[in-house]
C-alpha cells in the first residue's frame, strides 16, 4: 500500500506519458489522477512502467472501479493484466473478442494461467456459447483448450464452431470429450462428399459408434492405424474382419504390430480364427474353429 502524500509542486500529471516512469511510487500515487489514467489507458501499454509502478497503477484503478473495470480499460491493460488475480477478473464483464485477443496476446507463449482461465470462463459465459470466432481465437492461443473443457461445457459448442477445430486441438481429448464432440462434427460436416468428409471427421472418430464405423468401411476411406487405435473399443468389437479390412484398406497390415494393444487385442479375441487367417497377417488369439459363441449380454436382455 502506497502512503498518501501530497504531490510535489509542478509534478501533477496532465497526461499519461513516458516522463512518469521516473516518478517514485509515492509520486505516481499522489500525482496521477485515476480518472486521467482510465481515460488514457491506451497509452499505458505503450509506456514501459516499472514492476513497482504497475502495482501503483493497478491500485489506482481498483480504487476508481471497486466493482470491476469497464471494458474500455480492460482492453488496454497490457502487462497490467498479469498483475490481476482471478478474483479481480471475476468482477469483469468482457464481451468483445478484440478485448479477449488483446489480453491473450499478453500471455502468449505461456501455459494457460488461472487468470486466463477465469477470463475465458467469464467471456464464454457472457456469450452463452462457444461460437466459432471465439473457438478460433482460443485454439489459436491454446491448442489444447478444447480438451480442457468438461463434457458438460463442450455440450454448449454449436456444430458450426467445429469448423474451427484443427486435428492438433484434439490431441489431449479423452473418449468422454470425443463422445460429445463427434455428433457435432458429424452434423457440421454432413454435406461434404466421402473423401472430404473423412478428412474432416477423422480427428473426431474416437467418439464414433459402431454403425458409423461400418458405414465408413463401405467408403474406401483407408483409415490409418493411428486413427484406428484411438477408436472406442466398444465400437470396434462388433466389426467383422471384412469390415475392418475395408476400413483400413492398405493399412490393414499394421494390425500385426498392434495385436497386443487395445482395441486390436480385444477385437481379435472376438473374431473367428479362420476369419483372421484370411488377412494373411498371422494374427493369433481368435475363436478356434468349431466353437460356439454365446452373446451373454443378448441373453440377459431377453430374460
Amino acid at each position: 500500500e502506497v502512503e498518501k502524500t501530497a504531490c510535489p509542486s509542478g509534478k501533477k500529471a496532465r497526461e499519461i506519458d513516458e516522463s512518469l516512469i521516473f516518478y517514485k511510487k509515492w509520486e505516481l500515487e499522489a500525482c496521477v489522477d485515476a480518472a486521467l489514467l482510465a481515460t488514457q489507458m491506451d497509452r499505458v501499454n505503450a509506456i514501459p512502467f516499472t514492476y513497482e509502478q504497475l502495482d501503483v497503477l493497478k491500485h489506482k484503478l481498483d480504487e476508481l472501479y471497486p466493482q470491476g473495470y469497464p471494458e474500455s480499460v480492460i482492453q488496454h491493460l497490457g502487462y497490467l493484466f498479469l498483475k490481476m488475480s482471478p478474483e479481480d477478473i471475476r468482477k469483469w464483464n468482457v464481451t468483445s473478442l478484440e478485448t479477449l485477443k488483446a489480453l491473450l496476446e499478453v500471455n502468449k507463449g505461456h501455459e494457460m494461467s488461472p487468470q486466463v482461465a477465469t477470463l475465458i470462463d467469464r467471456f464464454v459465459k457472457g456469450r452463452g456459447q462457444l461460437d466459432k470466432d471465439t473457438l478460433d481465437t482460443l485454439t489459436a492461443f491454446y491448442p489444447g483448450y478444447l480438451c480442457s473443457l468438461s463434457p458438460e461445457e463442450l455440450s454448449s459448442v454449436p456444430p458450426s464452431s467445429i469448423w474451427a477445430v484443427r486435428p492438433q486441438d484434439l490431441d489431449t481429448c479423452d473418449p468422454r470429450q470425443l463422445d460429445v464432440l463427434y455428433p457435432k462434427a458429424r452434423l457440421a460436416f454432413q454435406n461434404m462428399n466421402g473423401s472430404e468428409y473423412f478428412v474432416k471427421i477423422q480427428s473426431f472418430l474416437g467418439g464414433a459408434p459402431t454403425e458409423d464405423l461400418k458405414a465408413l468401411s463401405q467408403q474406401n476411406v483407408s483409415m490409418d492405424l493411428a486413427t484406428f487405435m484411438k477408436l472406442r473399443t466398444d465400437a470396434v468389437l462388433p466389426l467383422t474382419v471384412a469390415e475392418v479390412q475395408k476400413l483400413l484398406g492398405p493399412h490393414v497390415e499394421g494390425l500385426k504390430a498392434e495385436e497386443r494393444h487395445r482395441p486390436v487385442r480385444d477385437w481379435i479375441l472376438r473374431q473367428r480364427q479362420d476369419d483372421l487367417d484370411t488377412l494373411g497377417l498371422g494374427l493369433q488369439g481368435g475363436i478356434p474353429n468349431g466353437y460356439l459363441v454365446l452373446d451373454l449380454s443378448m441373453q440377459e436382455a431377453l430374460s
Epitope: L54, L82, P114
Partner: nanobody, 119 residues
Amino acid sequence: EVQLVESGGGLVQPGGSLRLSCAASGSTSSINTMYWYRQAPGKERELVAFISSGGSTNVRDSVKGRFTISRDNSKNTLYLQMNSLRAEDTAVYYCNTYIPYGGTLHDFWGQGTLVTVSS
C-alpha cells in the same frame, strides 16, 4: 528465471567515466524492457535509465547528456555509459527487469555494483 550480474563499478574521480555492464542469463527471450536503478547511501532507490526491447531509451533529467543506456541483444548484456561523473552519482547501481511467466510478472534484480565518485 532470469539471472542478472552487474560489473564495471569502482572508484573514479569527478569528471571521470565508467561503463557498467549487466549480463543476463536464463529466460532472456522473455525480457522486454531493462532498467538501471541506483541507491545512494541513506536515500531511496531511484530509476536512472531504461531501454525497451525495440531499443527506445530514456534517462532521468539529472543525468541527461551524461549517461547513456544501451543493450547488446546478441550478448544479452545491458550497459550504462557514465560520463562527467559527479559526487552525487555515488551509489550502488542495480540492473532490473521483469518477465511474464505462469500468468504473472516476475521481477529480477542483480546484486548491484558500487560506484564511488570522489577525489
